[in-house]
């Protein structure tokens, strides 16, 4: 039975040209996290493997950086970066947990962070 929940940074906004940290946290389970995948729609951005460390997809290498922790930092944001991002936690023995973050990249200087929310 999967008892865990993923807490994410929720719906967030950031300015064009700036940077943003995407963060998820898996709680309420004793399952061992073996790998975390970060995806944008159907594109793989990065993988953090418990044994092998980080792998950043070559097409994002100049704009994506690992951390803090299991989070992901996106730099030099463009309006095309607006959309859904997913953190996919591979765990043993529970299986897979997925968290969703929606990022809106704004032209203006009015960019505010949304509240955290939980996904069961």
């Amino acid at each position: 039975m999967m008892t865990g929940t993923i807490e994410t940074t929720g719906n967030i906004s950031a300015e064009k040209g700036g940077s943003i940290i995407l963060q998820c946290h898996l709680s309420s389970t004793t399952a061992q996290v073996t790998q975390v995948n970060w995806e944008q729609q159907d594109q793989l951005l990065a993988i953090c493997n418990a044994d092998l460390g980080w792998h950043i997809s070559p097409s994002f290498k100049d704009r994506v950086a690992p951390g803090p922790g299991l989070g992901l930092t996106l730099q030099s944001l463009t309006v095309n970066d607006t959309g859904e991002y997913f953190c996919i936690y591979h765990t043993y023995p529970d299986g897979t947990y997925t968290g969703r973050i929606f990022l809106e990249v704004l032209e203006s200087s009015v960019a505010e962070h949304g509240a955290r929310f939980q996904i069961p």
């Epitope: 807490e7 418990a50 460390g53 950086a65 690992p66 922790g69 299991l70």
Partner: antibody, heavy 117, light 106 residues
């Protein structure tokens, strides 16, 4: 087995700069963040910042933004930290530490920096 | 920045005694890491993600907590456990450490 070898102790003049190294072995250098941590008897452990050698990205504690500069040489699997405009407050032991998402799992032995006036 | 307050600052325990030390955060954090450091040596990752024991850490250690309150518990003190233990958070930039709890053998 990962291993981090730091450069030797430094005795430096106030106002000068110092550059210390952290040579990594036993793992893929470009797949892990390299953190730097300052330890003093009074302040305990303080996080300075980290560099991701895979693309050179750096993330600094604002307190050390104008004090420390982090770099990495992937050809030699070595991370560096330069500390500028040294004062007595910079006298400390500085550690490098590897981190791949699950806290800092391997630490160097530390580099002691003593600033003399 | 988030301030981590560890208590007690210093404590002593007899062999076999149960030990609990706490780490209180000035704002809510999602998880806590703990490091063990013995005099003259580097810190070692001890407990990560609040409750997971690092490789080689004896099962007599455990970690728990949520929000602003976290703890490290040692079910039965042994001589080799005498050390300073630091908590660390990275739910918020910059990462911060507590000032440490020094655990001595009585």
């Amino acid at each position: 087995q990962a291993y981090l070898q730091q450069s030797g102790a430094e005795l430096v003049r106030s106002g000068a700069s110092v550059k210390m190294s952290c040579k990594a072995s036993g793992y893929t250098f470009t797949s892990y963040n390299m953190h730097w941590v300052k330890q003093t008897p009074g302040q305990g452990l303080e996080w300075i910042g980290y560099i991701y050698p895979g693309n050179g990205y750096t993330n600094y504690n604002q307190k050390f933004k104008d004090k420390a500069t982090l770099t990495a040489d992937t050809s030699s699997s070595t991370a560096y930290m330069q500390i500028s405009s040294l004062t007595s407050e910079d006298s400390a032991v500085y550690f490098c530490a590897r981190e791949g998402g699950w806290a800092m799992d391997y630490w160097g032995q530390g580099t002691s920096v003593t600033v003399s006036s | 920045q988030i301030v981590l307050t560890q208590s007690p600052a210093i404590m002593s325990a007899s062999p076999g005694e149960k030990v609990t030390m706490t780490c209180s955060a000035s704002s809510s954090v999602s998880q806590m890491h703990w490091y063990q450091q013995k005099s003259g040596t580097s810190p070692k990752r001890w407990i990560y993600d609040t409750s997971k024991l690092a490789s080689g850490v004896p099962a007599r250690f455990s970690g728990s907590g949520s929000g602003t309150s976290y703890s490290l518990t040692l079910s039965s003190m042994e001589a080799e456990d005498a050390a300073t233990y630091y908590c660390q958070q990275w739910s918020s930039n910059p990462s911060t450490f507590g000032v440490g709890t020094k655990l001595e053998l009585k």
